[in-house]
């Protein structure tokens, strides 16, 4: 098993609809054909798994049906989108990439993307 460099943006601001997107790029030492991508959230020294997908190179990322994540891959880049975020979900989102095949197994962990989520202000009552 070997280590691998993973790059991701330092900061992302979620949209008013609670959607945040960022790119996770890994420095693959070879031509991986099976890759597993996991998004972890670190807050208050606790690490929890947000979502994960295993994909064959050239195919779409497939997250579980009830996942809050979607994504696409292009070469050594994965474009990740997390939806349904609220202010309480603000935190450090870490991209983890595992090259499962061919051997050897590689593991790469990014430094994390700080995602800021601001709940939208409720619309004021308006007179018609």
């Amino acid at each position: 098993c070997k280590a691998m460099h993973v790059a991701q943006p330092a900061v992302v601001l979620a949209s008013s609809r609670g959607i945040a997107s960022f790119v996770c790029e890994y420095a693959s030492p070879g031509k991986a054909t099976e890759v597993r991508v996991t998004v972890l959230r670190q807050a208050d020294s606790q690490v929890t798994e947000v979502c994960a997908a295993t994909y064959m190179m050239g195919n779409e990322l497939t997250f579980l049906d009830d996942s809050i994540c979607t994504g696409t891959s292009s070469g050594n880049q994965v474009n990740l989108t997390i939806q349904g975020l609220r202010a309480m979900d603000t935190g450090l989102y870490i991209c983890k990439v595992e090259l499962m095949y061919p051997p050897p197994y590689y593991l790469g962990i990014g430094n994390g993307t700080q995602i800021y989520v601001i709940d939208p202000e409720p619309c004021p009552d308006s007179d018609f």
Epitope: C1, T33, E34, R36, T38, L40, V47, E49, A52, T54, M56, I94, K96, E98, M100, Y101, P102, Y105, L107, I109
Partner: nanobody, 119 residues
Framework: EVQLVESGGGLVQPGGSLRLSCAAS????????MGWYRQAPGKERELVAD???????NYANSVKGRFTISRDGAKNTVGLQMNSLRPDDTAVYSC?????????????WGQGTQVTVSS
């Protein structure tokens, strides 16, 4: 807690067949590479075969065409079908699982099962 429990070892004649099985407990089966290593007396441990969550397989040259690895997601087991066994296949066969848990790389091992090929 993750546990790997092997079964199916034993004594077999040259040219015979055996099937090893490894049952995995804990939430690793769908996320980890799983496979088999073996160690013969006085020799280094060597990879026999492994299989990824996506079903990609990898074999040692010495077992290609004779051994077949498979995984059963419904039972959380990994099997190793060993055909055309030879005396130099005699070893302790250990199941392993390799992957990561949150931010840490992990490798888990079973206790091992003895396979002896002898007439």
């Amino acid at each position: 807690e993750v546990q790997l429990v092997e079964s199916g070892g034993g004594l077999v004649q040259p040219g015979g067949s055996l099937r090893l099985s490894c049952a995995a407990s804990g939430n690793i089966f769908s996320r980890y590479i799983m496979g088999w290593y073996r160690q013969a007396p006085g020799k280094e441990r060597e990879l026999v075969a492994d299989i990824t969550p996506g079903g990609n397989t990898n074999y040692a040259n010495s077992v290609k065409g004779r051994f077949t690895i498979s995984r059963d997601g419904a039972k959380n087991t990994v099997g190793l079908q060993m055909n055309s066994l030879r005396p130099d296949d005699t070893a302790v066969y250990s199941c392993y699982a390799r992957g990561s848990d949150k931010l840490l790389m992990r490798t888990y091992w079973g206790q091992g099962t003895q396979v002896t090929v002898s007439s």
